[in-house]
């Protein structure tokens, strides 16, 4: 008795974060024995789409010519071979930006910070939002994700960084999101350049000195120090 068919690989090109109106292609790669590919979208009738494999039959393409709110969400794919359906792929989260106006990102007390000191990045939205997301250019994933509790919406979220080291320097943007869908994000804020100046020896912070991670923001999510100023907001994706 053969074991279960291996799960396929699911990915999106040019990426999984797509601006409204732009095109995106979802790829599902299985095995050479695949006869059909199926794409399911969470909370949508299954299958969301079916495609015949492209030669040499080990993958299929699902095209979205113009990204809209309807396409944002969580996807899984399967393939069918002569012995049946595969296990589901790991999920792909397709996020759309441009759903809301851009928030404003600023640094307190200043975007010019001395190594070893503290800085807080402040993401502000003129309308109430329930999720704020901070990203750093060339980082693999969001640094921090603050979501309000009990549906209480906020106009801002604070992202404290302490102690600051050279790895914190760089270009940041933030997004905001409404409770309608966590797969719908605002336009990105204008970029904020955080400039870290200071000592020649600039060691990365150790976990014993603060709750910042020992690795820098490029390596894993940055944990904030202290409590989130707005009690309605709690941390996610840490």
């Amino acid at each position: 008795q053969a074991g279960p068919l291996p799960k396929p690989t699911l990915w999106a090109e040019p990426g999984s974060v797509i601006s409204w109106g732009n095109s995106v292609t979802i790829w599902c790669q299985g095995t050479l024995e695949a006869r059909e590919y199926r794409l399911d979208k969470e909370e949508s009738p299954a299958p969301w789409d079916r495609q015949n494999p492209l030669e040499p039959k080990n993958k299929a393409r699902f095209s979205i010519p113009s990204m809209t709110e309807d396409y944002a969400g969580r996807y899984r794919c399967y393939y069918r071979s002569p012995v049946g359906w595969s296990q589901p792929s790991d999920p792909l989260e397709l996020v759309m930006t441009g759903a809301y106006s851009k928030p404003t990102l600023s640094a307190l007390p200043s975007p010019l910070v001395t190594s070893g000191k503290s800085v807080t990045l402040l993401c502000q939205s003129r309308s109430p939002m329930d999720t704020f997301l901070l990203i750093k250019e060339r980082a693999a994933h969001p640094l921090l994700h603050l979501r309000s509790e009990h549906g209480a919406q906020q106009h801002q979220a604070e992202f404290p960084m302490s102690p600051v080291t050279s790895v914190h320097g760089g270009t940041y943007r933030c997004f905001s999101s409404h409770g309608f869908s966590h797969y719908l994000l605002s336009h990105p804020s204008d970029p904020l350049e955080l400039i870290v100046s200071g000592s020649l020896e600039d060691p990365r912070p150790s976990p014993t000195r603060s709750v910042s991670t020992a690795a820098g923001p490029e390596d894993q999510p940055l944990m904030p120090t202290g409590s989130v100023p707005h009690s309605g907001l709690r941390r996610h994706w840490e």
Epitope: W20, T68, E69, M96, G98, A99, Y100, S101, K102, T104, Q124, R126, S127, P128, H155, H178, F180, L184, S186, H187, D190
Partner: antibody, heavy 120, light 110 residues
Framework: EVQLVESGGGLVQPGGSLRLSCAAS?????????ISWVRQAPGKGLEWIGS?????????YYATWVKGRFTISRDNSKNTLYLQMNSLRAEDTAVYYC???????????WGQGTLVTVSS | DLVMTQSPSTLSASVGDRVTITCQAS??????LAWYQQKPGKPPKLLIY???TLASGVSSRFSGSGSGTEFTLTISSLQPDDVATYYC????????????FGGGTKVEIK
Amino acid sequence: EVQLVESGGGLVQPGGSLRLSCAASGFSLSSSYWISWVRQAPGKGLEWIGSIDSGSVGITYYATWVKGRFTISRDNSKNTLYLQMNSLRAEDTAVYYCARHGDNWALDLWGQGTLVTVSS
Amino acid sequence: DLVMTQSPSTLSASVGDRVTITCQASQSINSWLAWYQQKPGKPPKLLIYKASTLASGVSSRFSGSGSGTEFTLTISSLQPDDVATYYCQHGYIRGDLDNVFGGGTKVEIK
């Protein structure tokens, strides 16, 4: 030239309806702005009616006194914003402005306004 | 509820005088406050944004200050061209607001 131009004002009877338009030129309503409708009754101050977010979802917020009588919408293909006004009353007589919220959160661009008179 | 209270409602001063208008928010609005000048038959004109930043093309006679709940618009030396009504406005947009503007201050020359 970057501008907003309102139209659709005029004389309407109490209980009637009117749709005002706000045509944007020189910038896209689907870029990252909020647009508000503001009115000013003769000899009175500025009164916020409501706002629409230019993001694709198009969230709208209204002043508490609106109570469902007014609706803000947009047509991105025409780069135009609308204010649908129903169950109009004499006290709705005013100059109606549309205005854009800039990156600085202030109303940095205003139309010239259109006069709505509610009278029998 | 977030309410903007502006004072005084009318102000009469002489040419060259220093004139101050205040705006009080019922809760903190950080620095998201703007000031406008409006002349009869015209739309409002943005003077100051983010509490203290002068809008493009506005005379340096105008200045703004404050943060949190207390804000001030100052005209350093009143000129005849400054006769107008001035409004403050907070930058937030949400569904529990009656208005985003203060009640206005009419500035006249003695």
